[in-house]
């Protein structure tokens, strides 16, 4: 009499998350009689996935009618696969008894679950930095399987090389996460720049996922200050101009000081944007020269984006 064999023809099966997995198993003989059970894993901690005999297994369907007398196909279909279903599944034949006695196991079928990575999320630095400084951007994506994944960084379409990437966990897991940190050197022209984190994975069919961050959130371009005097007007008034140029962001407060005393304070708002994303602002101050006996020291004081104030002074000559 031929010895019973339990045959699991596939060593491995790969299924996309959300799909159904079919795990095949056949026995070479009807005898000795006894049920088949499916387990994930081996040893005392193995998990019962399906039993012909009893239990409620809502996601598992036998491929063939298990109540048929001469059934030797013990394949099962598991619906709505998630990464948590990954593992090695064993089809195990039992001999009837009280209790049933384990007789023979199939060689096992490893189920791997292909799960898409989540959309990459790119986060920038908490505080703004100025040109020539290096800032870090972090990109994170989660829940993918298998572990192999490719991550690239781009700045305005140019690939970056200064980044460090980790995929966790290092060992076997049902799903994985990736975290990458890129270092970007800022320039004054980066207000309109963008960094892109691009993730490529087998589940994405060559259509990578992208996460973006605008450098406008990370950069501060400090203003240039220039104070000039227009020609004296007929009414003895001098028009002094403070030109604040090429700054970003728009958050700016300008204060005029006459001989150290506050004359006027203004806040920048609704400024037109330069091509490069920066802003310019011009403020005028009329000084009545006839009201002064001595030269007048005018100071244009600019406080930009919460930074320490920058001053530019100019002396208006009062002729005796």
């Amino acid at each position: 009499e031929e010895e019973l064999q339990v045959i699991q023809p596939e060593k491995s099966v790969s299924v996309a998350a959300g799909e159904s997995a079919t795990l095949n198993c056949t026995a070479t003989s009807l005898i000795p009689v006894g049920p088949i059970q499916w387990f994930r894993g081996v040893g005392p901690g193995r998990e019962l996935i399906y039993s012909q005999k009893e239990g409620h297994f809502p996601r598992v369907t036998p491929v063939s009618d298990p109540t048929k007398r001469n059934n030797m196909d013990f394949s099962i279909r598991i619906s709505n696969i998630t990464p948590a279903d990954a593992g090695t599944y064993y089809c195990v034949k039992f001999r009837k008894g009280s209790p049933d006695v384990e007789l023979k196991s199939g060689a096992g079928t490893e189920l791997s679950v292909r799960a898409k990575p989540s959309a990459p999320v790119v986060s920038g630095p908490a505080v703004r930095a100025t040109a020539e400084h290096t800032v870090s951007f972090t990109c994170e994506s989660h829940g993918f399987s298998p572990r192999d994944i490719t991550l690239k960084w781009f700045k305005n379409g140019n690939e970056l090389s200064d980044f460090q990437t980790n995929v966790d966990p290092a060992g076997k897991s049902v799903s994985y996460s990736i975290r990458s940190t890129a270092r970007v050197v800022l320039t004054r022209r980066d207000v309109h720049s963008q960094v892109i984190c691009e993730v490529a994975h087998v589940t994405l069919q060559g259509d990578p996922l992208r996460g973006t961050a605008n450098l406008s959130e990370a950069i501060r371009v400090p203003p240039f200050l220039e104070v000039t005097q227009q020609s004296m007007r007929a009414d003895n008034q001098v028009n002094v101009t403070c030109q604040v140029t090429k700054f970003y962001p728009q958050r700016l407060q300008l204060t005029w000081l006459e001989n150290g005393n506050v004359s006027r304070t203004e806040m920048a708002s609704a400024l037109p944007e330069n091509k490069d994303g920066t802003y310019n602002w011009t403020s005028w101050l009329l000084v009545n020269v006839s009201a002064h006996r001595d030269d007048v020291k005018l100071t244009c004081q600019v406080e930009h984006d919460g930074q320490p104030a920058v001053n530019k002074s100019f002396s208006v000559k009062v002729s005796a």
Epitope: L30, V33, S51, T67, R95, K96, G97, S98, V101
Partner: antibody, heavy 120, light 107 residues
Framework: QVQLVQSGAEVKKPGASVKVSCKAS????????ISWVRQAPGQGLEWMGW????????NYAQKLQGRVTMTTDTSTSTAYMELRSLRSDDTAVYYC?????????????WGRGTLVTVSS | DIQMTQSPSSVSASVGDRVTITCRAS??????LAWYQQKPGKAPKLLIY???NLQSGVPSRFSGSGSGTDFTLTISSLQPEDFATYYC?????????FGGGTKVEIK
Amino acid sequence: QVQLVQSGAEVKKPGASVKVSCKASGYTFTGYPISWVRQAPGQGLEWMGWIYAYGGNTNYAQKLQGRVTMTTDTSTSTAYMELRSLRSDDTAVYYCAREAGSSWYDFDLWGRGTLVTVSS
Amino acid sequence: DIQMTQSPSSVSASVGDRVTITCRASQGISSWLAWYQQKPGKAPKLLIYAASNLQSGVPSRFSGSGSGTDFTLTISSLQPEDFATYYCQQGASFPITFGGGTKVEIK
């Protein structure tokens, strides 16, 4: 052909023992368990116990525990049921039956039955 | 132990009639129920196994249904050779138990 042939009728006195045999042919004897079922005159079917030659497993009905022994001889493909300390209410037709379900218990092949009469 | 309750205990019917016998288990037994036919002086004969599967060689006028605790044996058109006693049997666990039987008699 596939069949179970039982030993002949027995008349026993109370307190005696009886051993009924059931010879299988036409199939792999060790592949299927054998149950013993009895039926008192005019009554229904009562399961007595079960034996699986493949591993020597047995399971007996609680009420017969200690009085019944089921054995097999694989060399002759024969199952035996011995009932001791016979009482008058043990008078019945004793059937052996092949149990063929993989995950469940049912009997697809029966012997013709052996009448055991217990009478003083 | 799982108790099996059969009803009715007897039924009188004519040839050609549709006959239904029910069996109730004291607890859930999934689909593990068998039906047997027994004629006087003969061994029982398996008709239906696993609640609804027709045993090889059994006429198709016999059918079974149900799962859990409530089961039915139906003879769609009674034939002269069908007058007999019918038993249900739970095959879910030890001890195996039988219903009390239903005698189908000629009206």
